[in-house]
Each structure stands twice: as C-alpha cells, then as structure tokens.
C-alpha cells in the first residue's frame, strides 16, 4: 500500500538533487583554489541535515547553521553586488568583473542556485513530488529559509559602497517583498555601509526615461536614508553596451553614457 504523502502547491525537489549539490560543490572547489580544502561530502551531509526528516513548514535558520560553518569564505566586503529580479545580468557582470561577488558567486549560493528541495517529517526521504509554496503553503520552507539565511548574512557582511542591480522593466523596480527588499536592505549595517548604489537596468532600446525618479526607487531611497546609509542611483540605458564596456573599458564608445 503506498504511503500517504503530503501534497504541496509548489514543484518538488529538483531531479538528482543530491548528485547536483555534490557535483556543484566539487566543481566550485576546483575552480576556486582557496576553497579546495572543503570536504564536499561533509557539505552535502550538512545540507541534507538541514531539511531531511523535518516538517518542510517548520525549518529554521538554526537548521542551516552546520552548513553555514562549512561554507565559511572570504568575500571582500566592498565588492558585493546585490540584485533583484535581474539575476542573469548580475551574474554576467560578475563573470566579467571578477573582483565583484553576487551571493551565487559564493559556495553556498552556487550550490543552491535555481534548485528546489524539501523532505518529509519523520522519514529520510526527499520529496520529489511537491514542496511547500512560499505563499500558498508556508514561508518557513527549506528553500525560503535557506535563501533568507544566506541573503541576510551576505548583506550583513557588506561594507563601504554596496551595489544593487534592479530590473527597470518591472512594474515595481524596487519591490519591498523581494529578497532584496525584505531581507537584504534591512540587514545592511549602517556603521559599515556608506552608500547603496542602485543600477536600474533599462529593457527597451529607445527607453530614455530617468527610472531613478520612479516612485519605487524613491521609496528605496527613503528606506535607506532612514537607516543612515547614503543612496545613489544610475540608469543603465544599454545593458548590452554596459557589459561590453566592463569587458573593454578602453573602447572609445565607452566614455558616453550607457
């Protein structure tokens, strides 16, 4: 008789999740010599321990603490790039500008990027059928708690000038309910962070509006200013040219506004 299984509203654990996490860990430690001491089997065991046999609506930051310890890493605090709803461009940028880091450029972020996972209470099984949806089921699910934990700590680590890439094509360029808006903004440390600089990425070829005047950007500025952090904003009118100029800053066309 098949055992009754809780049906959640979200997609189930990513296929071959254990193998994927382990393979990503090995690849990351090969690419980053400073992390070659990391024992990827221990990393997987700690990751698994955070959610296996636990109710997937009752996960805490504490569950991920063993994994956090194993993911200890040097991140230059003044080279942090946050992003919201524009992950691909942010990652393209840090692939070129190698001294800057998004969360997904760290081991922990790299391991979990684009993956879904959850377990079941009192069994050692991974649930590949369904996992809790943040809105429809519960917010304290394994994926949401993981990203909240690492995002909070990534923001806490930032200093000096922190950059954030925002999607100018969205109706809410700054969304208070995004991870950036609900977690990272509130965990920047005013004694360490001098300025938050927003880069608003334009979508349309002919879009010459100043999106730094958008009401949601003004809302972000207000939140940041109240936290005693300075705010600045730049329009990136041509993201393709922006990336090209990061690659080749000497190019004569890169002196004009991008």
């Amino acid at each position: 008789v098949p055992r009754w299984r809780q049906q959640w509203s979200g997609p189930g654990t990513t296929k071959r999740f254990p193998e994927t996490v382990l393979a990503r860990c090995v690849k990351y430690t090969e690419i980053h010599p400073e992390m070659r001491h990391v024992d990827c089997q221990s990393v997987w065991d700690a990751f698994k321990g955070a959610f296996i046999s636990k109710h997937p609506c009752n996960i805490t930051e504490e569950d991920y603490q063993p994994l956090m310890k194993l993911g200890t890493q040097t991140v230059p605090c003044n080279k942090i790039l946050l992003w919201s709803r524009i992950k691909d461009l942010a990652h393209q940028f840090t692939q070129v500008q190698r001294d800057m880091f998004t969360l997904e450029d760290t081991l922990l972020g790299y391991l979990a990027d684009d993956l879904t996972w959850c377990g079941e209470f009192n069994t050692s099984k991974i649930n590949y059928q369904s996992c809790p949806d943040w809105r429809k089921d519960c917010s304290n699910n394994p994926v949401s708690v993981f990203w909240k934990t690492v995002s909070r700590r990534f923001a806490e680590a930032a200093c000096d000038v922190v950059h954030v890439m925002l999607n100018g094509s969205r109706s809410k360029i700054f969304d208070k309910n995004s991870t950036f808006g609900s977690v990272e903004v509130h965990n920047l440390q005013p004694e360490k962070v001098q300025t938050l600089e927003a880069w608003v990425i334009h979508g349309g070829r002919e879009d010459s509006r100043d999106l730094c005047q958008d009401p949601t950007i003004k809302e972000l500025e207000s939140i940041i200013s109240k936290r005693n952090i300075q705010f600045s904003c730049k329009n990136i009118y041509r993201p393709d040219k922006f990336l090209q100029c990061v690659k080749n800053p000497e190019d004569s066309s890169c002196t004009s506004e991008i």
Epitope: Q73, V75, R153, A157
Partner: nanobody, 117 residues
Framework: EVQVLESGGGLVQPGGSLRLSCAAS????????MSWVRQAPGKGLEWVST????????DYADSVKGRFTISRDNSKKTLYLQMNSLRVEDTAVYYC??????????RGQGTLVTVSS
C-alpha cells in the same frame, strides 16, 4: 571604519595554551557578533568560533570544542580566544572578524599561532 588588531600568537608546544586578543575600533563593538577564523599554511579559511554581541551566546567548530573558549569585554572593545590543549593542527594565522559568517572580510593582519615540539 571597522578596524581590528589581533595579538597573542606565538610558538607553543603541543598541549600548551595561548590567549589571543583582538582590539576593535570604528564601530559599536557591543552591537556586533564577533568571530575568530583561521587559515593554516596552504589551506583555506576555517571558521573557529562566534560570540554574540552581548556575549551570552557562543558557538564553536567541532575541531576546537572543549579546548577553546571565546569571550569578549565590551567595555574594552576586545575579543578573546583562550586556546588550551593545543595541537599541531591548530597551527594557523588567526583572524578576528565582525559578524557571524559565513562571509568574512578580515581587516586585521592576524596573529600567527605555531604549535610544534
């Protein structure tokens, strides 16, 4: 600007003890969790211990649990690490850092601990 200065390292025999200190400035020390991390020769960064801002909560790596004790004196803006029963594998440069990790950008020069007979 956050600044830290570690001291107290040295050469010690296996089984011996050392007390590391970290003098901090440029931020409200008591508001921040503080950590010790270490880097052994040719190895990566390893988290050692963290203490909460108030000092009432501590956490240790399994490899040092029961041998090392982290503490702080907020009035002196100083972080400590008492290291007992030292082993050869504890040889490393020890850094203090603000925050609880896992992402660290240590600001000090560190202090070298060498455990050798």
């Amino acid at each position: 600007e956050v600044q830290v200065l570690e001291s107290g390292g040295g050469l010690v025999q296996p089984g011996g003890s050392l007390r590391l200190s970290c003098a901090a400035s440029g931020f409200t020390f008591s508001s921040y969790a503080m950590s010790w991390v270490r880097q052994a020769p040719g190895k990566g960064l390893e988290w050692v211990s963290t203490i909460s801002g108030s000092g009432d909560s501590t956490d240790y790596a399994d490899s040092v649990k029961g041998r090392f004790t982290i503490s702080r004196d907020n009035s002196k803006k100083t972080l400590y690490l008492q290291m007992n029963s030292l082993r050869v594998e504890d040889t490393a440069v020890y850094y203090c850092a603000d925050g609880r990790g896992p992402f660290f950008d240590y600001r000090g020069q560190g202090t070298l601990v060498t455990v050798s007979s």
